[in-house]
């Protein structure tokens, strides 16, 4: 029963984990621009792995793509790799872990194959926490390499966008989310190869013994008829994310209802 | 068209103070934010705060410290602009301007002169 | 508060010649994430509200004649009116609307010589 709470909560917090790293991996926010200098600004800066913003204090906001890809930062491109990675590991691994779950009946599938399968899907989402946590920490290293240059020129030739001496970015929502859904993705593997030495099927100590029957010699083994629960899952799993794109319509958020500057 | 049409002109007393109206139309007024700019006569534009409808959502220029109240009413599509402890430097065309992308101003309100008067 | 400075306060030409607003700024208008100065240019004719001509320092506003042309980045911007016409006098005003408090320019006054 353990075995599988610990499986079955395994591949939920994954589940989680790789949600978070493909909405981290969308968002636009993963630096901002920075307000100490210029808190009143009336032109807000932001930028994401595959485009920049530009919100304005009317409320429009512009995006632009980063359409080049010999013109981005060598980084940048490991990034958005460690990223993609990450979500395609962690994929691949929810999809090894729904057949490994134990309250799923596959066929007559051994518990060893499924001991295996949660194994294999456990390094996975371990490997793919790791690669998002090491994407969001390069990132983050990067920004704060820029912050105090202050002719920082991050993203030279992307699409023309170049930062001036006024615009300083800091760590965006993007990273907080990357770091705790990278987290969540290496609990959840975790989680799994710990449930996985509790599925394997343990050596038993017991002979063969032997029955003679008249006429006929049958040898019966104890031990190999394994009981198994007989409800299937019918559960969908719905993957419900943001991507984290702002739009005009957003509702803004302010610090006071009423702001004097 | 989008439209703005001010509310007449005012006679105050100095310490008195003065409200008046901007009623939008043309436009979905709860999406946009308004400005409200005044000119003393002979002078330049002054910039006095904005107010985006959609939630009440005000800023004020620090200048006019706290005696400017901007308020709007979204089911007549009205923007106000109350003035309070009135001087006689406050005599002004005041103006109302809607904000569009590009953080500009443009379309604005015919205007409403208000006179500060003993 | 950005101040904005208008040079010269008053500008008499001669029709069909050419006039020249300046607008410097006192901190820089230009944004790095759009690469775009947010300075807007107004007209204000006797008796009426300001009218936008131009924004972003060069982009002319729908319906504005093609003899009105912005230009500048940074701190310091150009009006021109490439050929002066009678209706074209009046007040110009310039704006910032990179950082609040928005200002304005103190104005410079067209005049016919």
């Known amino acids: 029963m353990a075995v599988t709470a610990c499986q079955g909560l395994g591949f939920v917090v994954s589940l989680i984990g790789i949600a978070g790293i493909i909405a981290a991996t969308c968002m636009d926010q993963w630096s901002t621009q920075d307000l100490y200098n210029n808190p009143v600004t009336a032109v807000f800066n932001y930028q994401g792995l595959w485009r920049s913003c530009v919100r304005e204090s009317s409320g429009f906001t512009e995006c632009r793509g980063y359409f080049t890809l010999l013109g981005l930062p060598a980084m940048l491109q490991a990034v958005r790799a460690l990223m993609i990675v990450g979500i395609v590991l962690g994929a691949i691994g929810l999809l090894v872990s729904i057949f490994a779950l134990k309250c799923i009946r596959i066929g007559s599938m051994e518990d060893s194959a499924k001991a295996n399968m949660t194994l294999t899907s456990g390094i996975m989402f371990i490997v793919s926490g790791l690669c998002a946590i090491a994407g969001v920490s390069v990132f983050a290293n990067m920004l704060v390499t820029n912050f105090w240059m202050s002719t920082a020129n991050m993203y030279t030739g992307m699409g023309g966008m170049v930062q001036t001496v006024q615009t300083r970015y800091t760590f965006g929502a993007a990273l907080f989310v990357g770091w705790v859904a990278g987290g969540l993705t290496l609990i959840g593997g975790v989680m799994m190869c710990i449930a996985c030495r509790g599925l394997a099927p343990e050596e038993t100590n017991y002979k063969a013994v032997s029955y003679h029957a008249s006429g006929h010699s049958v040898a019966y083994k104890p031990g190999g008829f394994k009981a198994s629960t007989g409800f299937g899952s019918n559960t969908k799993n719905k993957k419900i994310y943001d991507g984290g794109a702002r739009t005009e319509d957003e509702v803004q958020s302010y610090p006071s209802k009423h702001d004097y500057v | 068209q989008v439209q703005l049409v001010q509310s007449g002109a005012e006679v105050k007393k100095p310490g008195s103070s003065v409200k008046v109206s901007c009623k939008a139309s043309?436009?979905?007024?709860?999406?946009?934010?308004m400005n409200w700019v005044r000119q003393a006569p002979g002078q330049g534009l002054e910039w006095m705060g904005q107010?985006?409808?959609?939630?009440?959502?005000?800023k004020y220029s620090g200048k006019f410290n706290s005696r400017v109240t901007i308020t709007a009413d979204e089911s007549t599509s009205t923007a106000y602009m109350e003035l309070s402890s009135l001087r006689s430097e406050d005599t002004a065309v005041y103006y109302c301007?809607?904000?569009?992308?590009?953080?500009?101003?443009?379309?604005w309100g015919q205007g409403t002169l208000v006179t500060v008067s003993s | 508060d950005i101040v904005m400075t208008q040079s010269p306060d008053s500008l008499a030409v001669s029709l069909g010649e050419r006039a020249t607003i300046n607008c410097k700024s006192s901190?820089?208008?230009?944004?790095?994430?759009?690469?775009?100065?947010?300075l807007t240019w107004y007209q204000q004719k006797p008796g009426q509200p300001p009218k936008l001509l131009i924004y972003?320092?060069?982009t002319r506003e729908s319906g504005v004649p093609d003899r009105f042309s912005g230009s500048g980045s940074g701190t310091d911007f150009t009006l021109t009116i490439s050929s002066l016409q009678a209706e074209d006098v009046a007040v110009y005003y310039c704006?910032?609307?990179?950082?609040?408090?928005?200002?304005f320019g103190q104005g410079t006054k067209l005049e016919i010589k």
């Open positions: 301007a809607r904000f569009y992308y590009g953080n500009v101003m443009d379309y």
């Open positions: 704006q910032n609307g990179y950082s609040y408090p928005l200002t």
């Open positions: 972003w320092a060069s």
């Open positions: 043309g436009y979905a007024f709860s999406n946009y934010w």
């Open positions: 107010i985006y409808p959609g939630n009440g959502d005000t």
């Open positions: 901190q820089t208008l230009l944004n790095g994430g759009n690469q775009k100065n947010y």
